[in-house]
Interface confidence: low
């Protein structure tokens, strides 16, 4: 059993073009509050999957209200560390998500709103009882700045937490069975659950009897570094301290396996050990299963029956592709009538009618002329979504209010002159012209 | 097609032990979440165990913790409930069910297998 | 261990009518609640994952939602094969908990 413990020491706009604006406002001040999720082995599973090997909820933050015009600074943090307590054995390779929260405190009816910052999530390998490890996460235009540790309680004790110290009862030797606890020479040791002489400090265990080593050491009890020979190698030159032959330059020098494979010398040149999930020359190529993620947009994540179907997504209406990536262009189908705008809000779609016609793909056409009244004796003609009224002579206008001056568009040609009459109009025709309006 | 098929329950004393099997066909065990979740006469659903073979992770509600063992065999492709010390109120029928990943949500039920601890 | 506590234990409802069940979240749980169908003597189905989404194969009068740690199952017009008792499920968190169901049945 034991504490992994995060703390956070800044999260803010990252560097470079296009910081991101605060998250508060004068309108709406907030805090902040973070989740970390820690699940076992260097699985990338979705953040929603259970956080097996336990999570943690951080104190709300002072509230924060941003100054106007003043840069987005560094946001205030909550006291504290996270701490997720795990009961069994500390795996030595575990994934980490950390969410950034905001908790609006406006006038939001029901409370507080929360809402979802900022996710970053990582791969590490950590040994029980080590130091505090660095970390810097970018998610988008945001930079989270943290640390790190896995320490074991007691009576716990080793990189995984799996060897048990019992204070002793007195101060005489430490009973049948049982050693010294080193460096804690007022406690003892119970007898070892990993393999017996598997180093203490590069290897671990989670089963009885086994010794797995982390990143960086190699053999049956983890006390080879990878890439070393110790004084077996032929390169390069002696040292005076030890004697031995300092190594050069190897062909696993520098690890060149990806994805924490580990590197062994050929004879010829190198060979990768991949973990679970990896595979090609240097472990660079994922074998994607579920427990990846690789469903986007809430598609269901099935392991296919075989090796070479390792998942099927099933994709939620409005996705498609293989991996539910591509959102499908629903207004494609033209599903909005008369004329309607097609409008794809993701989660549904919208038909934004023309005038004079209504419902949710605008299939209704109203009576346009409903309670719509043409003045002076004017007639209502439906049409085109939209009301026109036919007006009586001598008027004119959208409702035939307005009066009309049937002379004033000058409809008689070649020099007519043109009076109105109560019945339309009269055209005087110029010498040497005739008809209704003199075009002859 | 995908099925789970529960056996090995029955009527067991108190303190005693059954082995319950989940046969799985259509998928792969190795990449997914199998589940126990039992379900007591009259009552509700509990969640009991989980494994993830590929890394041969697993998780326990508090009442069966030391008393029950989930493990996985990928090549028979079966998932097994070890039911040790068993108690009145472990009395439930035990159903397996596979667990999905993005969502977690349980996709695939087997049909159940009855477990009665009595004297 | 988070509690989803479920309301209302049992409700009675007519064929065609709007069914609200509803489960609340002891704490925030993301999105990783599941709805399942449960009939006598029969497996569960499920229904919803992820609070909203609509499992292939279930009708689409069934529908959830979420607002804040309050998830909501819901049916549009009930149906005689609707009668049955549902559960709510977190993933969220180790350990996985359920509702304690409710039990719909006919008026």
């Known amino acids: 059993a034991g504490v992994f413990e995060l703390q956070i020491h800044s999260f803010g706009p990252g560097p470079g073009p296009g910081a991101p604006r605060s998250p508060c406002s004068a309108r709406l001040p907030c805090r902040l509050f973070f989740r970390v999720c820690l699940k076992p082995g260097l699985s990338e599973e979705a953040a929603e999957s259970p956080c097996a090997l336990g999570a943690a909820l951080s104190a709300r933050g002072p509230v924060y209200t941003e100054q106007p015009g003043a840069p987005a600074p560094d946001l205030p943090l909550p006291d504290g560390l996270l701490q997720v307590p795990f009961r069994d054995a500390w795996p030595g390779t575990f994934s980490f998500i950390i969410e950034t929260w905001r908790e609006e405190l406006g006038d939001q009816i029901g409370g507080p709103a929360w809402s979802l910052l900022a996710r970053v999530a990582g791969r590490r390998r950590l040994a029980a009882g080590g130091p505090w490890a660095r970390d810097i996460q970018r998610a988008g235009a945001w930079e989270l700045r943290f640390s790190y540790r896995a320490r074991c309680e007691p009576p716990a004790v080793g990189t995984a937490c799996t060897r048990l110290c019992r204070p002793r009862s007195a101060p005489s030797r430490c009973g049948p069975g049982l050693r010294p606890c080193a460096p804690l020479e007022d406690e003892c040791e119970a007898p070892l659950v990993c393999r017996a002489g598997c180093s203490p400090e590069h290897g671990f265990c989670e089963q009885p009897g086994e010794c797995r080593c982390l990143e960086g050491w190699t053999g049956p009890l983890c006390t080879v570094p990878v890439s070393t020979s110790s004084c077996l190698s032929p390169r390069g030159p002696s040292s005076a301290t030890t004697g031995c032959l300092v190594p050069g330059p190897g062909p696993c020098d520098g690890n060149p396996c990806a994805n924490g494979g580990s590197c062994s010398e050929t004879p010829r040149s190198f060979e990768c050990t991949c973990p679970r999930g990896f595979y090609g020359l240097r472990c660079e190529v994922s074998g994607v299963t579920c427990a990846d993620g690789p469903c986007f947009n809430g598609g269901l994540c099935v392991g296919g029956a075989d090796p070479d179907s390792a998942y099927i997504c099933h994709c939620p209406p409005g996705f498609q592709g293989s991996n539910c990536e591509k959102r499908v262009d629903r207004c494609s189908l033209q599903p909005c009538r008369n004329g309607g705008l097609c409008l794809d809000l993701g989660h549904a779609l919208r038909c934004r009618c023309r005038a004079g016609f209504a419902g949710p793909r605008c299939e209704h056409d109203l009576d346009d002329c409903a309670g719509r009244a043409c003045a002076n004796g004017g007639t209502c003609v439906e049409g085109g979504g939209a009301h026109r009224c036919s007006c009586a002579l001598g008027f004119g206008g959208r409702d035939c209010r307005e009066r009309a001056d049937p002379c004033a568009a000058r409809p008689c040609a070649h020099g007519g002159r043109c009076y109105a009459h109560f019945s339309g109009l009269v055209c005087a025709c110029a010498p040497g012209y005739m008809g209704a309006r003199c075009e002859f | 097609e995908v099925q789970l098929v529960e056996s090995g329950g029955g009527l067991v004393q108190p303190g005693g032990s059954l082995r319950l099997s989940c046969a799985a066909s259509?998928?792969?065990?190795?990449?997914?979440?199998m589940h126990w979740v039992r379900q007591a006469p009259g009552k509700g659903l509990e969640w009991v165990a989980y494994i993830y073979p590929s890394y041969g992770y697993t998780s326990y509600a508090d009442s069966v913790k030391g008393r029950f063992t989930i493990s996985a065999d990928t090549s028979k492709n079966t998932a097994y409930l070890q039911m040790n010390s068993l108690r009145a109120e472990d009395t439930a029928v035990y159903y397996c069910a596979r667990g999905g990943y993005y969502y977690h949500g349980m996709d695939y039920w087997g049909q159940g297998t009855l477990v009665t601890v009595s004297s | 261990d988070i509690q989803m506590t479920q309301s209302p234990s049992s409700l009675s409802a007519s064929v065609g009518d709007r069914v609200t069940i509803t489960c609340r979240a002891s704490q925030s749980v993301s999105s990783a609640v599941a709805w399942y169908q449960q009939k006598p003597g029969k497996a569960p189905k499920l229904l919803i994952y992820s609070a909203s989404s609509l499992y292939s194969g279930v009708p689409s009068r069934f529908s959830g939602s979420r607002s804040g740690t309050d998830f909501t199952l819901t049916i549009s017009s009930l149906q005689p094969e609707d009668f049955a008792t549902y559960y709510c499920q977190q993933a969220s968190w180790s350990p996985i908990t359920f509702g304690q169901g409710t039990k719909v049945e006919i008026k």
């Open positions: 259509g998928f792969n065990i190795s990449s997914s979440y």
